[in-house]
């Protein structure tokens, strides 16, 4: 956030940039958390994303019995590996076709025994506050589907009648990794020393990192005619003085008519 300075006073302003602001010859260039001519004001909202999508990766092992292992399958650039990859991918696309979060598979290693396939199942979902539940459910469905197919598509009399056949006991889920996104944590971190006063509120399923000085949210502080300003001790209302009134009180809701004060009378309304 930047504020331009014109005129002779600019040189003085240069040495007075606050809160880590730097002078660029015209103005104070303020760090993310601050704004104002001297970077003296704390912002009331911080952009914390979110990411458009959240990903998960499941490390799985299946044993393909309808293909005999050959040395060429160890080499990822061989024609054999490429053909196996294509057939395996097609088979898995069929297996997981009913899972909207399914993106694809990535073979990490092929090893002997008929062909033991170490691979990742990749999942992705649009970010919503419920993304963890969505991906947890998707990983459960992946487990169900791979268990089912490796139980059903098996060799009979040494012959497979499916695109691929599997060893029922060779299916294992090694690890599940979900991209972590914690808006509350991000909000606290980015608010630095003001972290205690910034909160996450959702609007249209999008998280907003805001202080009570940001209007339009349930935690917003109503300063009436005053101005909300953040300090290290929290949000405070700076009350204004108009031609006719002084305003005071925690939310500047107490107006005192100047004429009454000058006439030695106090009147609150």
């Amino acid at each position: 956030r930047t504020t331009t300075c014109f005129g002779d006073g600019c040189q003085n302003t240069a040495s007075r940039c606050k809160n880590g602001g730097t002078w660029d010859g015209l103005k104070c260039q303020c760090p993310n958390l601050y704004y104002g001519e001297l970077c003296e004001e704390v912002v009331s909202s911080i952009d914390i994303g979110p990411p458009e999508t959240i990903s998960a990766q499941m490390e799985l092992t299946v044993t393909v019995t309808s293909v005999k292992f050959t040395e060429e399958l160890k080499n990822h650039s061989s024609q054999e590996f490429q053909e196996f990859k294509q057939t395996f991918t097609e088979q898995m696309n069929i297996v997981y076709s009913g899972i909207p979060e399914y993106v694809g598979v990535n073979i990490t290693k092929l090893r002997l025994g008929s062909v033991v396939v170490e691979h990742d199942v990749l999942l992705r979902t649009k970010y919503t506050p419920e993304y963890k539940t969505v991906l947890d459910n998707a990983t459960e469905v992946v487990k169900e589907k791979i268990t089912k197919v490796t139980t059903q598509q098996i060799m009979i009399n040494d012959i497979c009648s499916d695109m691929m056949c599997f060893n029922t006991t060779g299916t294992q889920v090694q690890n599940i990794t979900v991209t972590q996104y914690d808006p509350e944590e991000d909000c606290r971190k980015m608010a630095k020393e003001y972290g205690d006063y910034f909160v996450v509120e959702y609007r249209d399923q999008k998280p907003y990192c805001i202080s009570p000085c940001e209007p339009g949210f349930s935690v917003s502080k109503n300063c009436n005619l005053g101005k909300c300003q953040m300090s290290l001790s929290g949000p405070q209302c700076l009350c204004v003085t108009t031609e006719t009134h002084w305003y005071s009180g925690e939310t500047c809701n107490q107006g005192t008519q100047k004429s009454l004060v000058y006439g030695h009378h106090h009147h609150h309304h």
Epitope: V67, K68, Q79, E80, E83, T87, S161, D162, M164
Partner: nanobody, 123 residues
């Protein structure tokens, strides 16, 4: 690029014989699996027989004892000797190949295909 070309199809009487050939180019003949599939009018493509690089063979129940699959790795050729042909053997016969050592009669496992040759068994 792998190319498979079938030949040897034709019209034959029930009980007769035919020998189908498949010439493979661009295919490393000493590796993988070669197979014969067939598709009768209005039916799904079905596996007839396959042969692996080490000579291991397998046949569909309906052709066991009547058909013989063989390959010559040096000539990059595949054959299907069909004896005691029946009306239900009428179909387009396809040659298929895979670089992998397969043990499946499912067409989806084979990436390389010929155009097919028609076999009609009729009196």
């Amino acid at each position: 690029d792998v190319q498979l070309v079938e030949s040897g199809g034709g019209l034959v009487q029930p009980g007769g014989s035919l020998r189908l050939s498949c010439a493979a180019s661009g295919f490393p003949s000493s590796r993988g699996t070669m197979a014969w599939f067939r598709q009768a009018p209005g039916k799904e493509r079905e596996g007839v027989a396959f042969i692996n690089s080490d000579g291991r063979t397998s046949y569909a129940e309906s052709v066991k004892g009547r058909f013989t699959i063989s390959r010559d790795n040096a000539l990059s050729s595949l054959w299907l000797q069909m004896n005691s042909l029946r009306a239900e053997d009428t179909a387009v016969y396809y040659c298929a190949a895979s670089l992998l050592y397969l043990m499946t009669v499912n067409a989806a496992a084979y990436p390389y295909w010929g155009q097919g040759t028609m076999v009609t068994v009729s009196s």
